[in-house]
Interface confidence: low
């Protein structure tokens, strides 16, 4: 057959779907690889062809669109499973072609099983809620396009294994789950089960997400440098090791980049001709406030190094701060020598 632009296996799209549930999968060509959409391609006389390779097989085979009750079907650029089966797992390819043009991409589809408490190998999206920050909502994800707006589905929300009914601060509101006020005890997995009718059959969509309660923006502060501080003096003799920790607390801020860095005499350590190493460690609180520690280390400090200015800097979306470390050269202990005074006495 003639040449085809092969985009290979699109592993960025690790599609996971639950067994025995509907799944609609859009051909990635139009979303990520081509500059035109399906409608344009279709009206230009291009045809979209689907085929697949079963798990642990090398043989590409056509998808059977003649299964009972149209279990697998194609609609425009969407491949439909109504519903999926475990052995639908494999690599799926969509190919767009006519006599002069061809482009194709493959993507992995994994059909996963869940238990009665919705536990499964599915990778869960994480939804962050601000602690004690008024009313916040999570929305049942990825259910668009499964049923027309004329169909009114029933939605049931669960936390872990339990249906949400009389949760003090969480209210189911259709596709939304409202948290009247979020507490750390609200951390966990929330599942919405959307049930809708189609052609005399009833389908279920199960969507689970992880809620993580994080620090509130109303409590957020600029970075706080705990060390260095005014109470600690780094007094060293030449030849000793100089270790200065820079410990910074960052309030949780959504999408904020937290940074810590040292300057020596106003320059980055890399730009100074001394043997400096910097080691960083990061820890998080339960609400994802962050503590970063950067330890500046000079193995054998010189008297010149002890005269330099060492400043710890920190920056977040809330602001920038800096603090200088107090570094001194140890003053040698005085030597008490007996000095004989000349002419001590009358002349």
């Amino acid at each position: 057959s003639e040449r085809c632009d092969d985009w290979g296996l699109d592993t960025m799209r690790q599609i996971q779907v639950f067994e025995d549930e509907p799944a609609r999968i859009k051909c990635p060509l139009f979303e990520h690889f081509l500059k035109f959409n399906y409608s344009t391609a279709h009206s230009a006389g291009l045809t979209l062809i689907w085929y697949w390779t079963r798990q642990d097989r090398d043989l590409e085979e056509p998808i059977n669109f003649r299964l009972p009750e149209n279990r697998i079907s194609k609609e425009k650029d969407v491949l439909w499973f109504r519903p999926t089966l475990l052995n639908d797992t494999g690599n799926y390819t969509c190919m767009l072609r006519n006599t002069t043009y061809c482009s194709k991409v493959a993507f992995p589809l994994e059909v996963v099983q869940k238990d009665s408490c919705f536990n499964s190998p599915m990778k869960l999206p994480v939804h962050k809620l601000y602690i004690e920050y008024g009313i916040q909502r999570i929305t049942c994800p990825n259910v668009d396009g499964y049923f027309p707006s004329s169909v009114k589905p029933t939605i049931t929300w669960y936390m872990g294994c339990y249906k949400i009914q009389n949760f003090n601060n969480v209210i189911p509101e259709g596709m939304n789950l409202s948290f009247l006020i979020a507490f750390i005890s609200n951390n966990g997995n929330y599942t919405c089960v959307v049930t809708y009718p189609e052609n005399g059959r009833t389908f279920h969509l199960t969507r689970t997400l992880t809620v993580k309660v994080v620090g509130s923006p109303k409590n957020a502060v600029p970075p706080v440098i705990h060390s260095p501080n005014d109470h600690v003096v780094y007094e060293k003799e030449p030849g000793e090791e100089l270790l200065i920790p820079c410990t910074v607390y960052f309030s949780f801020l959504m999408d904020s980049r937290n940074e810590v860095w040292w300057t020596i005499d106003g320059k980055k350590p890399d730009d100074i001709p001394i043997d400096v190493t910097i080691n960083e460690s990061i820890s998080h609180s339960r609400t994802e406030d962050e503590t970063r520690t950067q330890i500046l280390s000079i193995k054998k400090v010189t008297s010149e190094d002890l005269k330099r200015s060492y400043v710890c800097h920190a920056r977040s979306a809330k602001g920038e701060v800096a603090k200088a470390a107090t570094v001194k050269q140890k003053v040698p202990a005085p030597r008490y020598t007996v000095e004989l005074a000349c002419g001590f006495g009358a002349t």
Epitope: T139, I171, E173, N176
Partner: antibody, heavy 119, light 112 residues
Framework: EVQLVESGGGLVKPGGSLRLACAAT????????MSWVRQGSGKGLEWVGR??????????DYAAPVKGRFTISRDDSKNTLYLQMNSLKTEDTAMYYC??????????WGQGTLVTVSS | DIVMTQSPLSLPVTPGEPASISCRSG???????????LAWYLQKPGQSPQLLIY???NRASGVPDRFSGSGSGTDFTLKISRVEAEDVGVYYC?????????FGQGTRLEIK
């Protein structure tokens, strides 16, 4: 920070039309139920209507005095709520506020836009 | 429609003294999930209303703790433990159990 900014108010003759807009920032607009509330000069608060989020079906409910004359809509791509007011009456003269939420109360309010219906 | 009735309609108070406003609804505002669909607002002169209390008794973010809400079903009360000059304005109760959403007539709090 949540902000709701209404616009489009003004003076209009009875029987005329006006379209109010409410630009929302600081929250995921598409997820939130939005309402219009009005207040006549020296009078109390009166609920005008509400539009649910599209995820909840986008259902729209209206207060009896405006049903059939007013239309609430939303453009989630523009984070904007609208109130199309037709066949305006003198009793529609009021400050119009857009608000967020519903079940647990209206948690945020705009500064309001004044509509005056007078010949 | 659920009719909301507030009393008193006017409330003169000495600063530092407590104040209490009553709100009665024409039918129970108790939601099937076990909370009351009642909110309280304060509208200060020349300003938009601000949410004080939701679900009958939950103080909204940033609201001083001198404000408290109580009650269930059809009878609700907003209490201010010690009135301050900045508390002047019109207080409204509102039900959100069902549409149309309805407000009380308002209670004007003024300093004696």
């Amino acid at each position: 920070e949540v902000q709701l900014v209404e616009s489009g108010g003004g003076l209009v003759k009875p029987g005329g039309s006006l379209r109010l807009a409410c630009a929302a920032t600081g929250f995921t607009f598409s997820n939130v139920w939005m309402s219009w509330v009005r207040q006549g000069s020296g009078k109390g608060l009166e609920w005008v209507g509400r539009i649910k989020s599209k995820a909840d079906g986008g259902t729209i409910d209206y207060a009896a005095p405006v049903k059939g004359r007013f239309t609430i809509s939303r453009d989630d791509s523009k984070n904007t709520l609208y109130l199309q007011m037709n066949s305006l009456k003198t009793e529609d003269t009021a400050m119009y506020y857009c608000t967020t939420g519903e079940l647990l109360g209206f948690d945020y309010w705009g500064q309001g836009t004044l509509v005056t219906v007078s010949s | 429609d659920i009719v909301m009735t507030q009393s008193p309609l006017s409330l003169p108070v000495t600063p530092g003294e407590p104040a209490s406003i009553s709100c009665r609804s024409g039918q129970s505002l108790l939601h099937s999930n076990g909370f009351n669909c009642l909110a309280w607002y304060l509208q200060k002169p020349g300003q938009s209303p601000q949410l004080l209390i939701y679900l009958g008794s939950n103080r909204a973010s940033g609201v001083p703790d001198r404000f408290s809400g109580s009650g269930s079903g059809t009878d609700f009360t907003l209490k201010i433990s010690r009135v301050e000059a900045e508390d002047v304005g019109v207080y409204y109760c509102m039900q959100t159990l069902q549409t149309p959403i309805t407000f009380g007539q308002g209670t004007r709090l003024e300093i004696k």
